[in-house]
Amino acid sequence: DFGLDCDEHSTESRCCRYPLTVDFEAFGWDWIIAPKRYKANYCSGECEFVFLQKYPHTHLVHQANPRGSAGPCCTPTKMSPINMLYFNGKEQIIYGKIPAMVVDRCGCS
Amino acid sequence: DFGLDCDEHSTESRCCRYPLTVDFEAFGWDWIIAPKRYKANYCSGECEFVFLQKYPHTHLVHQANPRGSAGPCCTPTKMSPINMLYFNGKEQIIYGKIPAMVVDRCGCS
């Protein structure tokens, strides 16, 4: 598997992973004790035919071209969790692994 | 997890799974011995904010609103394999479980 990595200076127009730091404090999400911020990343860019297609299915749908099927879009294809310490709304503080919080790779799906 | 199912008569505009039969013969893909065709399904529709979002990350990116980030798009969130019998290009015929060939659920990601 393969995915492009870009930054704010990149001129890449194709589907790419960009850095993004999520700041819970800035959101006013004060029920999250830790981390205050984390590197989440995000996906952006164009999905030309076949470029970075994660699934053979994507290619097959393109071939079959059914009514209303949009082209593939740039979306996370690999994600990872982060550990968080947070209030759970029942006056409890929980430490847990929250899945799919970080984008590790982007692709066309 | 939850996803909408639609058909060609549906008036649903939101992200939905639609039926699609992929016919390898129609594609001229004669290296595939079996199956000749299979039910692949596909995803189509609009992703209004928060509707069918698969990941908390999707919501966070929307909040952070970085440059160039598109809204979430309607994409497979659960897929399954099919067994295929095919020529592998080295004069061998292989039976294998090919991953991510069938869309079981669609969501906004």
């Epitope: - | 013969e25 004669d30 079996a34 067994n83 015929i93 292989i94 039976y95």
Partner: antibody, heavy 116, light 107 residues
């Protein structure tokens, strides 16, 4: 009704050649891969060759590779097996079969005897 | 090449009996095993493919199971027309190979 009819078998000397044919009817021949399987007298089954639906891809076991050639003519709904450099151990009934995940329909076979 | 070892090589049974034939592959073949029935002087007929899928028109008394290396063909209640030789075949990778056969005879 699916029908497969093999022909072209007979007695041939070691080192000789023979071309088997399999006439297909009752299904869309050009849509299916096809195979040849053989069975020596009183013995079990042995896969001989498979060809893709358009004829672009073929596969053989080592025992016949370089000596046997599978081919097809979709306009005539016919499958072929060209057998060269025949040996005594090639003596068998040769069956053609319609191929899916497995061989789902077989012809009645044609006997090839390699003997001097 | 993948070896397919079938057992028993022959068995005697009566009409109505439950019959089980086994096939062992020399390596993992996933679910890529087919079973055929052959009567003397006739072509083989497909019974089961992909380990457990009954082919069109095959009576429900025939069933297949297994995955990996161990596979079974079961005839739940033997009928007079079931006396024949049965072969397993792996369709996992070429060269495709067959078991040696199991001859089911009348007791």
């Amino acid at each position: 009704e699916v029908q497969l009819l093999e022909s072209g078998g007979g007695l041939v000397q070691p080192g000789g050649s023979l071309r088997l044919s399999c006439a297909a009817s009752g299904f869309t021949f050009s849509s299916y891969a096809m195979s040849w399987v053989r069975q020596a007298p009183g013995k079990g089954l042995e896969w001989v060759s498979t060809i893709s639906s358009s004829g672009s891809y073929t596969s053989y076991p080592d025992s016949v590779k370089g000596r046997f050639t599978i081919s097809r003519d979709n306009s005539k709904n016919t499958l072929y097996l060209q057998m060269n450099s025949l040996r005594a151990e090639d003596t068998a009934v040769y069956y053609c079969a319609k191929q899916d995940y497995a061989m789902n329909y077989w012809g009645q076979g044609t006997l090839v005897t390699v003997s001097s | 090449d993948i070896q397919m070892t079938q057992s028993p090589s022959s068995l005697s049974a009566s009409v109505g009996d439950r019959v089980t034939i086994t096939c062992k592959a020399s390596q993992d073949v996933s679910t890529a095993v087919a079973w055929y029935q052959q009567k003397p002087g006739k072509a083989p007929k497909l019974l089961i493919y992909s380990a457990s899928y009954r082919y069109t028109g095959v009576p429900s008394r025939f069933s297949g199971s297994g995955s990996g290396t161990d596979f079974t063909l079961t005839i739940s209640s033997l009928q007079p027309e079931d006396f024949a030789t049965y072969y397993c075949q792996q369709h996992y990778s070429t060269p495709w190979t067959f078991g040696g056969g199991t001859k089911v005879e009348i007791k």
